[in-house]
C-alpha cells in the first residue's frame, strides 16, 4: 500500500521539499504531541459490561517498541447481578496505527513502515444468527 | 533509548537507538491477519452502547480519512431496546501514530504524530461520587 | 455436505494426555464459532469449550479449566481439545459442534454435530 | 450455574398422539432456551432455538414456547421418527447448560 501524493490543490515550490530518493520517504520520528494526555473516563475497563485486560507487547526492533492490546475478559457480557450474560458477546474494538519497523540484513538497516492492529477495548454486542440459504 | 541485538560482525559505530530520521520505503506492510473488517463492521449498531461514525479528513496526514467515534445515547440499550440510563455509554479512546506531511504539501516527507481517537463505545456502571 | 468429524479418543490411563481432532467440511469454518460438548455413558449433554473464529474468545467448563485448551486451525478446517490430567469422570462420548452466530461469534446454541469420539479413561 | 429440569424423564405415547415435553429453569432465562433430539446412536439435533423458532429443516409439528423458567416443546402429532430423548439448553448465563433430557417412548 503506497502512501498517496499529497493533491495538486497546493501549489509547492519543489526546492522547498527535502530531496528523497525515489521510492522511499523522510521520516521524522520525533512525535508531534508526544505528550498529549489520554483523559478517557476512569477505569473504564473493569466498569464495562464488557470488562477487558491489558497487556503490553514489547519489540525493539518497532518504534514505539511497546504496544498495549486489550483482551476481553469473558465471553458474554457482565449483567445487572454482576452475572456473565451469555446470550451477548464481549468482542474487541480495534484501531489501525503506524509503527516503523527496523530491519536487518547483514549489517546493514533498513525502515519499513508498518500498520498494526491495536485491540482498543471491547463493547457488547448482540449475536446474530447466520441462516443457511 | 532502545538498544538492539545485533550481529556481532558488524562495526559496533551505528547508534543503537532508533535515529531521529530515517529514511522508509514508500509501501506500507499491512501485519493485520487474523482479522476480517467485515466481522466487525456492524458493531457500532449491534453495540448495547452504539455508537455513529463520523469522517475526518485531512489532506496532510497519513491516513487522510480516519473515522471517529460518537456514542448515540448517554444510557445503554437494554433488552427491551429501550435506552437504560442507569448504566452509561462512554467512549474508548486510543492514541495513534499517524504520518503529518512536514513540511506543509511536500510529497515525500513526514514527521510522526500521535493522535487520539474514539474508537467505539463500551457500557459502564456509572461511579457514585460520595461527598464527605 | 456440510460435515464435522471427530477423532482421537481412545483408551487413556487417569493423569495421561490425549488431543482430540474435528476435521470440517461444507461450510466457510472461520466464519463459525466451535465447541465441544460430553455426554457420559448413559447420561445427558455437557458443554465442554467454545472458541470464536479466530480464536480471540475462549470457554472452559469448571470442570475442565486448566487441563483442557481448545484450539484450531482455520487453514485446516480443524478444531481440536487438547485434553491433559484426564480423569475417570472425563469418559465420554466427546463431540465437536458448530454454533448458529454469524460472524464467527457465540450464540451457544449449535446446529451441526459430529458423530463423536469416544474417550475412556481408566487404570 | 443454572439447573434445568426436565419432566417428565419418560413420556409413554402412541404415533398420532401430542407429546408435551416440560423444561423448568432454577431463575429466568428470558427466552434463551433451545431444544435438541438425540436418537440412540446418534448425535444431538437442533430443533427450537430462543424457545420458540424452528430451526433449519425442523417440520412444524415441533413448537416451542414459554419464557422465563417454564418451557415446552410440543409435537402435535407424533410421527415414529420422533421417539428419542430430547434435551433443552440455556444460554442465557454462564455457564450454557443443558436440562438431564425426556426419553419419548412409544407407548
Known amino acids: 500500500r503506497k502512501i498517496p501524493k499529497v493533491g495538486h490543490t497546493f501549489f509547492q515550490k519543489p526546492e522547498s521539499c527535502p530531496p528523497v530518493p525515489g521510492g522511499s520517504m523522510k521520516l521524522d520520528i520525533g512525535i508531534i504531541n508526544e505528550n498529549q494526555r489520554v483523559s478517557m473516563s476512569r477505569n473504564i475497563e473493569s466498569r464495562s459490561t464488557s470488562p477487558w485486560n491489558y497487556t503490553v507487547t514489547w519489540d525493539p526492533n518497532r518504534y514505539p517498541s511497546e504496544v498495549v492490546q486489550a483482551q476481553c475478559r469473558n465471553l458474554g457480557c457482565i449483567n445487572a447481578q454482576g452475572k456473565e450474560d451469555i446470550s451477548m458477546n464481549s468482542v474487541p474494538i480495534q484501531q489501525e496505527t503506524l509503527v516503523v519497523r527496523r530491519k536487518h540484513q547483514g549489517c546493514s538497516v533498513s525502515f519499513q513502515l508498518e500498520k498494526v492492529l491495536v485491540t482498543v477495548g471491547c463493547t457488547c454486542v448482540t449475536p446474530v444468527i447466520h441462516h443457511v440459504q | 533509548g532502545i538498544t538492539i541485538p545485533r550481529n556481532p560482525g558488524c562495526p559496533n559505530s551505528e547508534d543503537k537507538n532508533f535515529p531521529r530520521t530515517v529514511m522508509v520505503n514508500l509501501n506500507i506492510h499491512n501485519r493485520n491477519t487474523n482479522t476480517n473488517p467485515k466481522r466487525s463492521s456492524d458493531y457500532y449498531n449491534r453495540s448495547t452502547s452504539p455508537w455513529n461514525l463520523h469522517r475526518n479528513e485531512d489532506p496532510e496526514r497519513y491516513p487522510s480519512v480516519i473515522w471517529e467515534a460518537k456514542c448515540r445515547h448517554l444510557g445503554c440499550i437494554n433488552a427491551d431496546g429501550n435506552v437504560d440510563y442507569h448504566m452509561n455509554s462512554v467512549p474508548i479512546q486510543q492514541e495513534i501514530l499517524v504520518l503529518r506531511r512536514e513540511p506543509p504539501h511536500c510529497p515525500n516527507s513526514f514527521r510522526l504524530e500521535k493522535i487520539l481517537v474514539s474508537v467505539g463505545c463500551t457500557c459502564v456502571t456509572p461511579i457514585v461520587h460520595h461527598v464527605a | 455436505e456440510v460435515q464435522l468429524v471427530e477423532s482421537g479418543g481412545g483408551l487413556v490411563q487417569p493423569g495421561r494426555s490425549l488431543r482430540l481432532s474435528c476435521a470440517a467440511s461444507?461450510?466457510?469454518?472461520?466464519?463459525?464459532?466451535m465447541h465441544w460438548v460430553r455426554q457420559a455413558p448413559g447420561k445427558g449433554l455437557e458443554w465442554v469449550s467454545g472458541?470464536?473464529?479466530?480464536?480471540?474468545?475462549?470457554g472452559y467448563a469448571d470442570s475442565v479449566k486448566g487441563r483442557f485448551t481448545i484450539s484450531r486451525d482455520n487453514a485446516k478446517n480443524s478444531l481440536y481439545l487438547q485434553m491433559n490430567s484426564l480423569r475417570a469422570e472425563d469418559t465420554a462420548l466427546y463431540y465437536c459442534?458448530?454454533?448458529?452466530?454469524?460472524?464467527?461469534?457465540?450464540?451457544?446454541?449449535?446446529?451441526?454435530w459430529g458423530q463423536g469420539t469416544t474417550v475412556t479413561v481408566s487404570s | 450455574e443454572i439447573v434445568l429440569t426436565q419432566s417428565p424423564a419418560t413420556l409413554s405415547l402412541s404415533p398420532g398422539e401430542r407429546a408435551t415435553l416440560s423444561c423448568r429453569a432454577s431463575?429466568?432465562?428470558?427466552?434463551?432456551l433451545a431444544w435438541y433430539q438425540q436418537k440412540p446412536g446418534q448425535a444431538p439435533r437442533l430443533l427450537i432455538y430462543?424457545?420458540?423458532n424452528r430451526a433449519t429443516g425442523i417440520p412444524a409439528r415441533f413448537s416451542g414456547s414459554g419464557s422465563g423458567t417454564d418451557f415446552t416443546l410440543t409435537i402435535s402429532s407424533l410421527e415414529p421418527e420422533d421417539f428419542a430423548v430430547y434435551y433443552c439448553?440455556?444460554?442465557?448465563?454462564?455457564?450454557?447448560?443443558f436440562g438431564q433430557g425426556t426419553k419419548l417412548e412409544i407407548k
Open positions: 431463575q429466568s432465562v428470558s427466552s434463551y
Open positions: 472458541i470464536n473464529w479466530n480464536s480471540g474468545s475462549i
Open positions: 439448553q440455556q444460554r442465557s448465563n454462564w455457564p450454557p447448560t
Open positions: 461444507g461450510f466457510t469454518f472461520d466464519d463459525f464459532a
Open positions: 430462543d424457545a420458540s
Open positions: 459442534a458448530k454454533d448458529i452466530a454469524a460472524a464467527g461469534e457465540f450464540y451457544f446454541d449449535m446446529d451441526v
